[in-house]
């Protein structure tokens, strides 16, 4: 009866050669797609000259198949019951699931100009940078193809910098032929309640980006959780995309292809300001942009991005404070479309369906030494793109799951 099922589950969710979990863990059987919507700026000149609100129009989806590569350098460590691995990155464009091609053009913030003015606050340096920005005919905004914006281009301004800096720029540059990790996770052999929980990331138990407990690497990578998930649980997971650990809470029961699953969502509380949720105090790293830590819904991850002023939010600034989006026109936050959820089969702890949604923004500030930023009268957190990464268990896999797991229990 129940004891036999528990025993079977405990055996099959262990991350070692020969188990169901291991086979699917090494290389996911689920097709995962990442859809991008790019925020095309409609009034670049007005913004640069008059510090007007930025009018954006989202264009998308542009879809890529991702996470199709098997984990690499898988190494079991019997001493501490862990398994380490690298998660290789790869993206293949899917024209049939996209509104256009990778050659489509977009007017977006000039990433290098915005970043350089932030990274080099020294006024003497800014004078030099200004001359190079002007010499390269760069401006506050630029026109780039989708491929360039996402995967990288040689920036004309950075090409004139006399220092050995990387001249390649892109929202996800470098991506193809790179890997995330090394992750070291518990394999569950000694304690099934720890299976898939991250022990270390890049050799450390903390990130060195945040103060206090915010810096901890908590939970799993969200692809699975320890088995026998309860609705009352708060599921912790780490996302390298947002450079932090976060959590999800139970929202509803869902039937997914005949499999009963629990839908866990990222609550708005996770994005709240320290005023509303004191637990978030250590995610507030500066006082000016955050209006003394009263702003909410955006996360400054510059420390994780070599000082580049990157801010992560939910799409269309969902759950963000009004001051964040007051400089941007054309946004329509919508909970159903823009929140993140995980559909978890509670017996195995496997995530059978998910939608990870996030928006990447860049801060641009006025600078009286940089001509193209001189006329700005306020700071802007500029949305560049938002993404929807989804995966759903395939019909064949679902059938197998029904017969081997949920069928046996019912």
């Amino acid at each position: 009866g129940d004891m036999l099922i528990q025993k079977t589950i405990k055996k099959e969710v262990v991350l070692e050669e020969g188990t169901i979990a291991f086979k699917n863990w090494v290389k996911t059987g689920t097709e995962i797609y990442r859809q991008f919507w790019i925020f095309d700026v409609q009034n670049p000149q007005e913004v640069m000259m008059n510090s007007s609100n930025i009018q954006v129009k989202q264009r998308g989806p542009y879809t890529y198949r991702v996470r199709f590569l098997a984990k690499e350098n898988i190494t079991q460590d019997p001493k501490d019951n862990t398994v380490s691995f690298l998660q290789p990155n790869g993206a293949i464009f899917e024209p049939s699931l996209s509104v256009g091609t990778e050659a489509d053009n977009f007017t977006v913030l000039n990433l290098a100009v915005a970043a350089a003015s932030h990274i080099y606050p020294n006024p003497f340096v800014q004078v030099v940078l200004n001359s190079l920005i002007n010499k390269s005919k760069s401006s506050m905004f630029q026109v780039r193809t989708l491929r360039e914006l996402l995967w990288g281009y040689t920036d004309p301004f950075l090409s004139l910098v006399p220092y050995p800096v990387s001249t390649r720029v892109g929202m996800f540059y470098p991506y193809n032929n790179t890997a995330d990790g090394v992750y070291k996770v518990f394999n569950g052999k000694d304690s099934i309640s720890k299976v898939a929980i991250i022990d270390t990331y890049k050799g450390k138990r903390n990130l060195s980006y945040w103060e206090s407990y915010c810096d901890m690497i908590n939970g799993t990578d969200a692809a699975s959780f320890p088995p026998f998930v309860e609705k009352s649980q708060v599921l912790q997971f780490f996302s390298s995309d947002i450079c932090r650990s976060i959590y999800a809470v139970f929202e509803s029961d869902v039937n997914l292809k005949g499999i009963p699953v629990y839908r866990f969502v990222l609550p708005s509380k996770a994005f709240a300001s320290p005023v509303q949720n004191p637990d978030n105090h250590c995610f507030c790293t500066e006082k000016i942009i955050s209006k003394n830590c009263t702003s909410y819904g955006v996360l400054d991850i510059s420390k994780c991005k070599e000082g580049k002023p990157v801010y992560i939010s939910l799409p269309h600034f969902l759950y963000a404070s009004p001051d964040v989006s007051e400089t941007i026109d054309g946004l329509n936050p919508n909970e159903e479309e823009h929140r993140t959820y995980l559909d978890i089969e509670p017996i195995t702890g496997f995530t059978l369906q998910f939608a990870k949604r996030l928006q990447v923004n860049l801060l641009v500030k006025p600078s009286n030494k940089i001509q193209v930023l001189k006329r700005l009268k306020r700071n802007y957190i500029v949305p560049i793109l938002w993404l929807n990464e989804t995966g759903t268990i395939g019909d064949e896999k679902a059938k197998m799951f029904r017969s081997q797991v949920t069928g046996k229990i019912n």
Epitope: I119, Y120, F124, K135, P162, Y163, G307
Partner: antibody, heavy 119, light 112 residues
Framework: DVQLQESGPELVKPGASVKISCKAS????????MHWVKQSHGKSLEWIGY????????GYNQKFKSKATLTVDNSSSTAYMELRSLTSEDSAVYYC????????????WGQGTTLTVSS | DVVMTQTPLSLPVSLGDQASISCRSS???????????LHWYLQKPGQSPKLLIY???NRFSGVPDRFSGSGSGTDFTLKISRVEAEDLGVYYC?????????FGGGTKLEIK
């Protein structure tokens, strides 16, 4: 006024590592690149590399890439250079030097740290 | 790497004389951004180097106007119009236009 105070002389054995420090004062440490320069006895100068304290970004002379590691501690306005797998060829005076502000010149220099590698 | 060749190796002068040091690079020092990052340093005995001239001809603050720099492309010159006792030491040219940045071998200015 701007000052760069380097750590004292070092006598180390071949194969060992050493970490030289350079404490900056009189300016905003995170605003300027810090460079390191080697001067072997009676010889010319060689640029090793630089670090930008604001974000820890580095640039190296390829010749020294596997020899030197540059780091900073912004809380104490101190730059460090670690030299590893030392040989007698590494015996030299090592200078830290502040960047003049993105025009690739060094406007202030430390007094130098003498490193002697000998068994 | 760009090789910086300084001549002469040693320059004996009398106080009050004019001195001229040449520096030649193995390739043009005009950076793709149009600037020429050729600088001159003086290292007095037992001291750290000090910046004299940056970007070919700009005197660094506090440097007397008897020091002047000129040149372009691959040929550069440092001139001292009237040598004083405090000018003695080793002069180095330096290029920051191509990584790795390199120094010349030095020219020792000494009393005749």
């Amino acid at each position: 006024d701007v000052q760069l105070q380097e750590s004292g002389p070092e006598l180390v054995k071949p194969g060992a590592s050493v970490k030289i420090s350079c404490k900056a004062s009189g300016y905003t440490f995170t605003d300027y690149n810090m460079h390191w320069v080697k001067q072997s006895h009676g010889k010319s100068l060689e640029w090793i590399g630089y670090i930008y304290p604001y974000n820890g970004g580095t640039g190296y002379n390829q010749k020294f890439k596997s020899k030197a590691t540059l780091t900073v501690d912004n809380s104490s306005s101190t730059a460090y250079m670690e030299l590893r797998s030392l040989t007698s060829e590494d015996s030299a005076v090592y200078y830290c030097a502040r960047d003049g502000g993105y025009d690739v010149y060094f406007d202030y220099w430390g007094q130098g740290t003498t490193l002697t590698v000998s068994s | 790497d760009v090789v910086m060749t300084q001549t002469p190796l040693s320059l004996p002068v009398s106080l009050g004389d004019q001195a001229s040091i040449s520096c030649r690079s193995s390739q043009s020092l005009v950076h793709s951004n149009g600037n020429t990052y050729l600088h001159w340093y003086l290292q007095k005995p037992g001291q750290s180097p000090k910046l004299l001239i940056y970007k070919v001809s700009n005197r660094f603050s506090g440097v007397p106007d008897r020091f002047s720099g000129s040149g372009s492309g691959t040929d550069f010159t440092l001139k001292i119009s009237r040598v004083e006792a405090e000018d003695l030491g080793v002069y180095y040219c330096f290029q920051g236009s191509h990584v790795p940045w390199t120094f010349g071998g030095g020219t020792k200015l000494e009393i005749k």
